[in-house]
Every structure is written in C-alpha cells, then in structure tokens.
Interface confidence: medium
C-alpha cells in the first residue's frame, strides 16, 4: 500500500492556514471538491465543499473555511481563517466522483494550532488588522455525506473544527505569517 504523507503546519491562534491542493486538470476541473478533517478512528468528515459542478475562481465560504477552485491551474485553494487551538488535526482535500469513492489529493495536512501571539514583525498586536472581504456565495454548496472507509486512520489527534455561520467579512490578524513546516516520511 502507498504510504500516506503529511505536511505539517504550525500556526498560532488567529492566523490563517492557506494551502493549495493540486489535481489533474483534465480529469477533475469541474468535479466537486471538499475539505475534510480526519479524526481518530473515524470516517473523514467534510467541513466544506465547492459547488456541483465546481465553479472557477468562485469563493465558497463555510464559517471560517474558504475554498476557491482554480480550474485553469488544477488547484484548490483552502483557507482556514482565525484559527483556534481546537482546529488542530489532520486534514485532506478530496474530489467527489460519484458513484466512485472520493479521490484523495496528497499530501494530507497536519495542522497544529497553538495559543499565544505569533510575535512576527509586521503583524504585531498594534498593527492594523487585515480584512478579507469575501462576497457571500449565492449558492449553498451541498456536500455529499458519504466518505471513503479506506481513508480512516488510526492515530491522528482528536480535533474539532469550528464551522460557524457564513460571514461576508472576516477580520484576520497575522494573515501574512503563514508557516510551512514539512514532515518527511
């Protein structure tokens, strides 16, 4: 079996996780895509998904999660804003392709959110907050309920990702401080 790899992101509360998931352009451009959390011993849980069919460069926001699918480049951009410690956990991007099982995109994202101010110059406590103005989506993206039993894992840490009411304006601090820490398996 293929060994699953992870990429680890270590961020502080209030920061933004900003990742991209690459996919095969011709095959999956208009397919519906989703962002999932994988909790210990459970089936992956879908937190947000694009519309069906997926629209090009159209932000879909579910609480603090924003998905943007760039068809021309074969990538899904995922942002989780205003991170909380409880967001820590193992995440993955998947492509829905009914009636087949979802197609998982590598690598999985191991997110570790810790308390405390990041201390990064240029994004200090006194600096002006960055504001993302995200147009509210006119269409609610309905996410399929099924997940693949093959993607269940044994030992990622438990985590609860907060998915709140969609909001058209999110105040973010430290949005430029996106920390990348690779895990090489």
């Amino acid at each position: 079996a293929t060994k699953l790899t992870e990429e680890k992101y270590e961020l502080k509360e209030g920061q933004t996780l900003d990742v991209k998931c690459d996919y095969t352009l011709e095959k999956f451009a208009s397919s519906q895509k989703a962002w999932q959390i994988i909790r210990d011993g459970e089936m992956p849980k879908t937190l947000a998904c694009t519309e069906r069919p997926s629209k090009n460069s159209h932000p879909v926001q579910v609480g603090r999660i924003i998905l943007e699918d760039y068809h021309d480049h074969g990538l899904l951009r995922v942002r989780m804003v205003n991170l909380q410690v409880e967001d820590s956990g193992l995440y993955q991007c998947v492509i829905y392709q009914p009636p087949k099982e979802p197609h998982m995109l590598f690598d999985r994202i191991r997110l570790v959110v810790t308390k405390g101010f990041s201390g990064t110059p240029g994004s200090n406590e006194n600096s002006t907050q960055n504001v993302y103005k995200i147009p509210p989506t006119t269409t609610k993206a309905l996410c399929p309920l099924y997940t693949s039993p093959r993607t269940v894992t044994q030992a990622p840490p438990k985590s609860t990702a907060d998915v709140s009411t969609p909001d058209s304006e999110i105040n973010l601090t430290n949005v430029t401080d996106i920390i990348r820490v690779p895990v090489f398996n």
């Epitope: 991209k20 480049h73 951009r77 690598d107 994202i109 401080d177 990348r180 690779p182």
Partner: antibody
Framework: QVQLVQSGAEVKRPGSSVKVSCKAS????????ISWVRQAPGQGLEWMGG????????NYAQQFQDRVTITADESTRTAYMELNSLKSEDTAVYYC??????????????????WGQGTTVTVSS | DIQMTQSPTSLSASVGDRVTITCRAS??????LAWYQQKPEKAPKSLIY???SLQSGVPSRFSGSGSGTDFTLTISSLQPEDFATYYC?????????FGQGTKLEIK
C-alpha cells in the same frame, strides 16, 4: 526551461521611486512564489517580499513594508517590484526569483530555484 | 523574524579539501532550508532545498543535512569552480531570511 528576465539598470535620485520588472518565459507562472531579493554592494542577500500571481496578495519583509509594492500581471507573465522614497542605501542589485511547489501545499518547496539576472539600481544625487 | 547565523563567515581551503559550512536558525524551521552559491557579479544559484535534497544539475559532491535549528552544507572534494560565497535561507515562514554568507577562498 523557465527563465526570468529583468528590466535594465536604473539611476535614480533620492526620494524618487523605481519599478523593476521580471518577465517569466517557459513553464507555469501563476502558481509559483515570485520573490524579490536585493544585495547591496559587498553585502549579503536580503529578502524583500514575494507574491503568488494567481492569488495576488503579497507578503513583505517588515523593513520594506511601507515602501515596497509587489504586483504581478498574469496576462504578461510579469512581476513587478516598486520601491518608493529611495535613499542612497537602496543602491543595490535587485533580483527576482521563483519558488515553486509540486504538491498539496508546497508553495515554495524547492526554495528559490530560478533567478533573474539582476537589476542594478543606483541612487545618487 | 527568524535569524539565520552562518559560520564561518570566511574560509580558506584547497582543491580536494572537504569543507563544511554551518547554519543555525534562531527557532525551529523543520527542514525548510535552502543553500545557494553565488559568484561575483552573478545571481545566486540554488544548490540544496529542503535541507538535504540536491537541486537538479548540482554535482553530488554537494550535500546538506540537519533539521530543526542546525544545518550543514558539505562539499566533499573542493573543485576550482566551487570557490564562491554560500548562503543559507529559511523558507519556513515569512519573511524568508538569509544567513550572512560564507566566503570560500582558495588557500
């Protein structure tokens, strides 16, 4: 093979602005980080900021935050770095460089693997 | 900012020597470290990425190691074309930062 070609040398007066361009040929442009790095005479390398053209939002080093603007034009595959309120200490060679990533979230997994030839900016009264 | 400290700042060596340059980060950066070589009047050239992976086309006499805060660049057998200045750079978090450089000179 990707190449980054920068605009020519500039001589500027203190207090003025300079805009340096960096045109990419070959390969993909939009999803890579285009960084700007400068090197004053006899000094080391200094990262000024970077942008992913597709996403459009730049990141800046704090010491340049108030004076630098980094932009990118996907249609012409060109990145720009504009530095304002020039001082004699800004005399340097300015490089653009590409960082890229093949997978999931590897925006710049390979470090800065392709560099422009450099643009000399001289600030003198 | 993450501070990158290289040592030594200059180094004299002979062709055939084995040379090691070290780079220390002020905080952990996992393996997000690159090494560059720069010759006078030229743009830097990427040698190593992700701390230990050799950039395509770079001779195998160059190698990198380390993770966390301590990293090394090793040239197993110096060649005449290797005399240059070497920089480490972290790309763990913005702003990316470079070490101050190590100038490798002919003894």
């Amino acid at each position: 093979q990707v190449q980054l070609v920068q605009s020519g040398a500039e001589v500027k007066r203190p207090g003025s602005s300079v805009k340096v361009s960096c045109k990419a040929s070959g390969g993909t442009f939009s999803i890579y980080v285009i960084s700007w790095v400068r090197q004053a005479p006899g000094q080391g390398l200094e990262w000024m900021g970077g942008i992913i053209p597709l996403f459009g939002t730049p990141n800046y080093a704090q010491q340049f935050q108030d004076r630098v603007t980094i932009t990118a034009d996907e249609s012409t595959r060109t990145a720009y770095m504009e530095l304002n309120s020039l001082k004699s200490e800004d005399t340097a060679v300015y490089y653009c460089a590409r960082g890229h990533g093949p997978g999931s979230s590897h925006y710049s997994y390979y470090g800065l693997d392709v560099w422009g030839q450099g643009t000399t900016v001289t600030v003198s009264s | 900012d993450i501070q990158m400290t290289q040592s030594p700042t200059s180094l004299s060596a002979s062709v055939g020597d084995r040379v090691t340059i070290t780079c220390r980060a002020s905080q952990g950066i996992s393996s997000w470290l690159a090494w560059y070589q720069q010759k006078p009047e030229k743009a830097p050239k990427s040698l190593i990425y992700a701390a230990s992976s050799l950039q395509s086309g770079v001779p195998s006499r160059f190698s990198g190691s380390g993770s966390g805060t301590d990293f090394t660049l090793t040239i197993s057998s110096l060649q005449p074309e290797d005399f240059a200045t070497y920089y480490c750079q972290q790309y763990n978090s913005y702003p990316y930062t470079f070490g101050q450089g190590t100038k490798l000179e002919i003894k």
